[in-house]
């Protein structure tokens, strides 16, 4: 572990209430193929414990979705990954809209610091699939 | 190699017969920019040779495709990446539907064990492009 | 640095003139969360300074975009990442069309050599968003 290979892959636990756009994550071998090796979960949000550059990746699939269901909503369904705390470091890192699709998937490299908590905000009225092969979120430390 | 940096990037060789949804892959410098350094191919399927956590990534583009061609089919075209053998470890790791798009691309971290064979199943009537910049599949060992 | 952990994450600076499909990138802490650690920029194009296998990733979001705007154009908007110089090594590495979506995102492993310059060509009449959480391009050295 001293090599700094912090890594996590999480599965969806649940969505927050109507006024909370955050997705709540869970991880651990007992749950399937998710795991936390270094980072930790704080009330379903991922907290970084080691400074460095990380590869952040996410895939979210909407449940009961068709091209029409994503396009007919007035407010497009959007997924944003960002640092939500500490407030002084709050920033959006990655943002995608579903438009006429039912899945978004992306990844990026970004510097993260110990204590950064990442939030994944899903705005819109559609809920995500909890199938572990359709919705997941992970980070991988890649260098100091 | 003893560092355990197993890595592979494959290009599409061919699709299977009608009742076999698997894509068959190939790799090697003679074929272009694909390669296998550690993992191996068994009848076009990727077999892992070292335990660890891997980043698995894939992009598949449908040939002769337009938004209408993906949306007008009764059964949506879907791509699933999973462990298909040994049977005791069979599981779907990554799944995406094309909906009104012609390309899917995603990635995830997952634990894999020596002997795991990964299959990429494309269900539906549309065929994938074999252009090496449009359809590819790879794994990268990232930590024990 | 001697470990060879070359890495870069870039944000969009600007698009080229009409007859130049290339996107022009910029990076550095003063600009936000982009950075160059090893690779360098040459007139907005990313140049590799160390041989190896790299993970190349990109996300491009079209500005002022809706499903209809991407689908109603005769020539679909396409993004291609390739080696554009030296000419002897020119090749397309990664290609995606937007079809009815407004964002493309993908990644792949590919061998790159010192001196390779990567170009990201966006063809079509739609322009990309310069929001740093919507459009970005990066590479990560992963092994010799």
């Amino acid at each position: 572990e001293s090599l700094g290979w912090d890594i996590a892959e999480l599965q969806l636990n649940h969505t927050g209430p109507q006024q909370d756009p955050r997705l709540y994550w869970q991880g651990g071998p007992a749950l399937g193929r998710s795991f936390l090796r270094g980072p930790e979960l704080d009330k379903g949000q991922l907290r970084i414990r080691r400074d460095g550059i990380y590869m952040v990746h996410i895939q979210v699939t909407l449940a009961i979705c068709s091209s029409t269901s994503t396009s007919r909503h007035h407010h497009p369904t959007t997924l944003a990954v960002g640092i939500c705390s500490p407030a002084s470091r709050s920033i959006s890192l990655l943002r995608l809209s579903f438009h006429q699709g039912c899945t978004i998937a992306s990844q990026r490299l970004t510097p993260l610091a110990r204590g950064d908590t990442l939030c994944t905000n899903l705005t819109g009225t559609l809920l995500p699939s909890r199938n572990t092969d359709e919705t997941f979120f992970g980070v991988q430390w890649v260098r100091p | 190699e003893s560092l355990g940096w197993d890595i592979a990037e494959l290009q599409l060789n061919h699709t299977g017969p009608q009742q076999d949804p698997r894509l068959y892959w190939q790799g090697g410098p003679a074929l272009g920019r694909s390669f296998l350094r550690g993992p191996e191919l068994d009848k076009g399927q990727l077999r892992i040779r070292r335990d660890g956590i891997y980043m698995v990534h894939i992009q598949v583009t449908l040939a002769i495709c337009s938004s209408t061609s993906t949306s007008r089919h009764h059964h949506p075209t879907t791509l699933a990446v999973g462990i298909c053998s040994p049977a005791s470890r069979s599981i779907s790791l990554l799944r995406l539907s094309f909906h009104q798009g012609c390309t899917i691309a995603s990635q995830r971290l997952t634990p894999l064990a020596r002997g795991d064979t990964l299959c990429t199943n494309l269900t539906g009537t549309l065929l994938p492009s074999r252009n090496t910049d449009e359809t590819f599949f790879g794994v990268q060992w990232v930590r024990p | 640095e001697s470990l060879g952990w070359d890495i870069a994450e870039l944000q969009l600076n600007h698009t080229g003139p009409q007859q130049d499909p290339r996107l022009y990138w910029q990076g550095g802490p003063a600009l936000g969360r982009s950075f160059l650690r090893g690779p360098e920029l040459d007139k907005g194009q990313l140049r590799i300074r160390r041989d190896g296998i790299y993970m190349v990733h990109i996300q491009v979001t079209l500005a002022i975009c809706s499903s209809t705007s991407t689908s109603r154009h005769h020539h679909p908007t396409t993004l291609a990442v390739g080696i554009c110089s030296p000419a002897s090594r020119s090749i397309s590495l990664l290609r995606l069309s937007f079809h009815q979506g407004c964002t493309i995102a993908s990644q792949r492993l590919t061998p790159l050599a010192r001196g390779d310059t990567l170009c990201t060509n966006l063809t079509g009449t739609l322009l990309p968003s310069r929001n740093t959480d919507e459009t970005f391009f990066g590479v990560q050295w992963v092994r010799p």
Epitope: T15, G16, Q19, A63, I64, L127, R130 | - | -
Partner: antibody, heavy 119, light 107 residues
Framework: EIQLVQSGPELKKPGETVKISCKAS????????MNWVKQAPGQGLKWMGW????????TYADDFTGRFAFSLETSASTAYLQINNLKNEDMAAYFC????????????WGQGTTLTVSS | DIQMIQSTSSLSASLGNRVTISCRAS??????LNWYQQKPDGTVKLLIY???RLHAGVPSRFSGSGSGTDYSLTISNLEQEDIATYFC?????????FGAGTKLEIK
């Protein structure tokens, strides 16, 4: 203890207006949206929509646009349902309901307000 | 809109019996299915959410199961206080929709 306490039964004539209140206690009112549910006599439950208690933005189900209005008195931790130009088919019990941790799962319900519409 | 069908409007059972109430959705709702109990006095309580998760304080004789479009609520050992009407609700997308209810009576 979290509670949603609704105003008492109402007897109204067709064409009149009614305003039903739902007073919340035991939590920070602006942290959770307030939903409204209708139950006609002998019928099932029908979701009417919800109001964002932080922004005040209402969302109405298709059958409840026009004559129906959700509003707030944040300082009193109270949500309101107003129905204008009452019709016979508005005769029902109306419930306010609130989520806890999970989207669209209603952990807390008001006791209901019975509205009778009769000429 | 997603329709929620509770085909049995009323059900009679003896105390101590095992009772199962079913609910069908007009399309796959990915286990976003909740059950509520409405007592004769009109009070409504959450029993089960996400198909099978028991809400805090609800007796363990209540359980839920199902997937896709078909779901059920089971009371393993019927008690007098369980006499009520039970509603299913899909919580996967707006507008939220409920079943018509199943009224449980003592035989």
């Amino acid at each position: 203890e979290i509670q949603l306490v609704q105003s008492g039964p109402e007897l109204k004539k067709p064409g009149e207006t009614v305003k039903i209140s739902c007073k919340a206690s035991g939590y920070t009112f602006t942290n959770y949206g307030m939903n409204w549910v209708k139950q006609a006599p002998g019928q099932g439950l029908k979701w009417m929509g919800w109001i964002n208690t932080y922004t005040g933005e209402p969302t109405y189900a298709d059958d409840f646009t026009g004559r129906f209005a959700f509003s707030l008195e944040t300082s009193a931790s109270t949500a309101y349902l107003q129905i204008n130009n009452l019709k016979n088919e508005d005769m029902a019990a109306y419930f306010c309901a609130r989520e806890e941790d999970y989207r669209y799962v209603f952990n807390y319900w008001g006791q209901g307000t019975t509205l009778t519409v009769s000429s | 809109d997603i329709q929620m069908i509770q085909s049995t409007s009323s059900l009679s059972a003896s105390l101590g019996n095992r009772v199962t109430i079913s609910c069908r959705a007009s399309q796959d709702i990915s286990n976003y299915l909740n059950w509520y109990q409405q007592k004769p006095d009109g009070t409504v309580k959450l029993l089960i959410y996400d198909t099978s998760r028991l809400h805090a304080g609800v007796p363990s004789r209540f359980s839920g199961s199902g997937s896709g479009t078909d779901y059920s609520l089971t009371i393993s050992n019927l008690e007098q206080e369980d006499i009520a009407t039970y509603f299913c609700q899909q919580g996967v997308t707006l507008p939220l929709t409920f079943g018509a209810g199943t009224k449980l009576e003592i035989k």
